[in-house]
Every structure is written in C-alpha cells, then in structure tokens.
Amino acid sequence: DAHKSEVAHRFKDLGEENFKALVLIAFAQYLQQCPFEDHVKLVNEVTEFAKTCVADESAENCDKSLHTLFGDKLCTVATLRETYGEMADCCAKQEPERNECFLQHKDDNPNLPRLVRPEVDVMCTAFHDNEETFLKKYLYEIARRHPYFYAPELLFFAKRYKAAFTECCQAADKAACLLPKLDELRDEGKASSAKQRLKCASLQKFGERAFKAWAVARLSQRFPKAEFAEVSKLVTDLTKVHTECCHGDLLECADDRADLAKYICENQDSISSKLKECCEKPLLEKSHCIAEVENDEMPADLPSLAADFVESKDVCKNYAEAKDVFLGMFLYEYARRHPDYSVVLLLRLAKTYETTLEKCCAAADPHECYAKVFDEFKPLVEEPQNLIKQNCELFEQLGEYKFQNALLVRYTKKVPQVSTPTLVEVSRNLGKVGSKCCKHPEAKRMPCAEDYLSVVLNQLCVLHEKTPVSDRVTKCCTESLVNRRPCFSALEVDETYVPKEFNAETFTFHADICTLSEKERQIKKQTALVELVKHKPKATKEQLKAVMDDFAAFVEKCCKADDKETCFAEEGKKLVAASQAALGL
C-alpha cells in the first residue's frame, strides 16, 4: 500500500513519542560519536518536518524516502569529516548506496567512555528535573554503544527504565530498590544486544535464506502445533522485520513488528496455546513476551519422519519440485519434534539431509543411496551432547570464575593473536553458559547452551572482523554460520604462534585494584592470565594455576597492608621473578 508521504505514514502509525525515540536511536546508531544535544536537535528538526507532512502529504519533500530524508539530515552535521573521517564520503553518494555506506561504518566497538553509574540521588534528581531528557539520554547512550540493538525492543527497555525510576525514586531506600533493577536491565540489555547482533550478522553475512532457516527451526520448536503454512507466514514476516531493523529502517521495523504481534494474537488459536497472557499486555510488553514465550506442547502421536523423508518414493520428486519448500518442511517437522535440540544442530541436520539429497537424487536408485541418511545424524547429535556434558561437569567442579579461567586458557591457546580485552570479554561470556544452562534438565541444556554459544562466538566474530589478526578466527567465522561452534571447538593449540615478548609492565599492579568491584578485580586477574598464556603458550594447567594462586594471594596481602602502594611495588617484583622462574620465561 503506497503512501504519498512515507514519513507522514510512519508518524501517524507510530505516534509522536515512538517516532521521536526511534529516529533518535537510528541517528545515534549511525553517528555514534555525536554529542547528545546535536542528535536531539536533528531529531526535533525531523519531527517538525514530519508534522508538516502529516498536515499536508503533498508538501515539499514529503514524498522523499526515509533514507533520503534521514541521510540528508545526517549529512548536515558540520564536524562529520573531523569526527568520522572516511564516513563523510558516504554523503557524496546517492541512495541507496549512501545508506549502505553508513551501515558499513557502524562500529561494534566504538571508542566511547565506559558508562559510569552516578549516585542514586544524583540520578533521581536528574530524572525528576527533566524526565524526557533523562530517558532520551538513556536511548542515546545504549544505541550509540550498541549500533545493532533491536530498536523496538530498546523502547521496551526504556519503558522499564522509566518505571524503575518512577517507583524507586520515591522509595524509602532508593538504592536498594533501584540498583538491582538497573543491574537486571544492564545484563538483559547486553544479552538482547548480542542476540540481535547474531540475527543481523546472519542476514548480512549469510543472507536471507540462512536467517529464514534459523527462524523456521526456532518457530517450529516454539509453535509445534502450528501448520507449516502458518510457520512459513510468520517466518516471512519476521524476516522482513529483522531485515528492516538490521538495515537501519527502524520506523518500518517497529511498525511491522507491531503488525506481526497483532497478527499472532488474532490467530493464536492456530499458533500456540501459550500466547494468551502475552496477548493481554500493551504493545511493547506484548511483542517482548511473544519473542520470549515458552515452547508449546508437542502434538500427540506425530508420525515418524522417515515415512515422508526417507521411505517415500517421492522424496526426489518433491525435492526437485521445490527444493527450499521441501527442506523447509523437513526442518519444520524435525524441529517441532525436537525442542531438546539446539537450533544450530537442527540446521546442521537439515544441511546434511540437503547434501545427501543433492548426491542421492542424482543417482539411478536414490532410495538405495539415502536410505541410511538418518544414521548420519547420530554423530552430529552426540557431539554437542558430549561437549555440554563434559563442560557442565567441569563447571560444577570449578564454579563460574575458575571455569571462565579454563576457557580463557583454552581460547588463548587456540587463537593467541586475538586482543587480550576481546579474549577476556568473550571467554567470560562463554563461561557464563555454565550458570545459565547447566542447571537445566537434559532436555533443555542443549538449546540453552549451544544457541547461547552461537551468540557469544558471534561477538568474537564481529569484533575480530573490525581488526582481523587470525586466519583461524576468520575461517571459523566465515565458512559456515551453523558450524562456528564446532569449528572453534576443534581448534587445537596454535603451533605457529610466536610467544609474546615478556613485558614486566603488563604484570605491574597498583593499590587501585583494592577499590575495584569483585567483577573488575576478576577482569584484572583474567587479563593477566591471558597475557601469561600469550608469553608462555605451552605452560601447563598446573603451572598456570600455581602462578594465578600466587597472584591472588599477592593481591589479597597487599590490599590488607598499611602501605598498599609500597607492598604492590616490592611484592610485585618478587611475584614477577617467581612467576618467570616457575614458567621458565
């Protein structure tokens, strides 16, 4: 349905508040270094223009595309070349190349200061003084640090952020009320950002077909009672929503997401019995709830898959007639029967099935060739099962911190060229799989663990893509989306790596470590551990454990000393010498 003015159409659909918030998110995700005030000014100008178009859709420039309008606005920023360098060259291009150019310059790791949380009273005063600015600033700070954050979901986070301040700033103990809520929003926000980043990487690096396959598998697990045609419709609509958001078309994305939620709720009888509560909520909560809804129960008495996909004489005929539809049906049927499998495992099985059909349907007797295709699935299923079992046992034995350390050592030995901050961040997140998933029963462990690992390894891939340093990382990241985790798991110690020169400065610590939070202190120690492995990649677990134990004792001792700084200086030298001796550096 063509509209005379796209900007007027979206303004009317979304309402002024959401329109302004989404334009702010879009601008902050594109121009990540621009000051808050500059973005607010641009957003206000766009909003005023949109209002003129609502009043008269035939008014000058109202017929222009959103990319043209927004791009023109971004290109008015005076300091574009000084602040962004070659991104300024995007402004010389015409749409759609200009928008593609902006997208390519999104930075997953922008050089921005860490967000420091002010005192609760300071935050509450700011909230009461100007609620609107306070909430806009939240959107801006999150969007510029997470340029692929799912925009309609960020509106939901902002709503919860506002609710937290509204409630807690009038509580007797403001801090006790507010801080846990802010911690929860921060942790959920990071997880949401990382999950969306994988969706965008899937679409941008592996194409629409890869994303649709992922969506078929996930929605079939979630809605096993829905017909294939229904799941296919949902997949098509969901793909459009995420394509738009990943492409910077945030107004269209939010609008289409709302339409999809409306459709799902109007048709919940043919989709899932678990949607009732979600569908009673307001729009933002409803969309979030649907996205997180638990899997519906599997229909009773589902027939064996073999009948249609192995035993039937029509397998190759059906495959030839519509390859992707037939493979989609296979994936749907397999996934709805296996909520206990990870999505990536289901996609590996579908890929194996496709490869087998490609080979066997070319034969004179295809059935003879593909009759045992399901036997090929067994090792593919057992590999993640065994890996999760082993790692959950290790996690239960070590606890989260030491489990993270084991992974830090493991991954530093696999890809020692990767920067230390990236190795620490990624390994810490990999280690969180233990507390997140190992508590689950067997039937829920694999979908929890392996799909979470896919999200974390994608963080490694996008960070590494910015400054590639390891061919092995590039290979695992680019060859196959669904085989990334097995590819990294299969990497052994990099024998070609030349150990890093020893630098005493890396292992020099000061009294400021004593005032850090437990988490920050862990990161300092884990950073030292990565550096140790980079200096001595052949060090044994026992050697590394001994050095780390000495290091922990050293920090504890000096933090208790009267003259902390002197202790760190003197004892630090002794520790470095002892560590060098222990590791033969």
């Epitope: 070319a362 034969a363 004179a364 059935h367």
Partner: nanobody, 115 residues
Framework: EVQLLESGGGLVQPGGSLRLSCAAS????????MSWVRQAPGKGPEWVSA????????RYAETVKGRFTISRDNSKNTLYLQMNSLRPEDTAVYYC????????SSQGTLVTVSS
Amino acid sequence: EVQLLESGGGLVQPGGSLRLSCAASGFSFGSFGMSWVRQAPGKGPEWVSAIDSGGADTRYAETVKGRFTISRDNSKNTLYLQMNSLRPEDTAVYYCTIGRSTSRSSQGTLVTVSS
C-alpha cells in the same frame, strides 16, 4: 513449476520398436536421476527403468532387460526410452518421473502393442 512432457507413443505391432521422449523443465534436470514408469489399463504403476544424472548408471526392470534402453541428453533437458522387441504386455501409458517416484505428474504417452 516442474513440467514433464512425454511423446513418441503410438500403435506398433509385436516385435516392433518405438522411441519415447520426455522434455523436462522447471527444475535442474541435469542434477536428478530420472525414471520411466508405466501403467497398464486397470493396473497399478510399474517402474520400468532409471538413469543417473550423468547417464552413466542405468537400471532396468527384469521384464524389459535387454529390450529397452534408457538415455538422456542434459543439454536438451530430455530423457529417452528406446523400446525394441515390443510385446503385447508392454501396452501401457508410459510417463517419466524424477528419481524413482511412481507418482504421475504428467499425461504420459500411450503405447499400444497389437497385431
């Protein structure tokens, strides 16, 4: 959309010969093994012969072995069945299929062997 169009059938005397053709479109013909299937009046479908995608491997039902020859020309997207020493019991509608399917998705071509 997959389309298979058979031709070359007709009335022939016992001992005679016919060459059937099947023109294929709507799928990657050169990637799939193909078969000929026949259905005599009042009977179920019977698989006759199969060929792999490259034309190197051919298979035949015992009833036609030594008399029929299956072949293909991938450049023309066409499947052939050369039928020699025809017998009255070969009378049937012949149709080509993808793989070893016996489902009929085309009209077929009628072969009648009678004196």
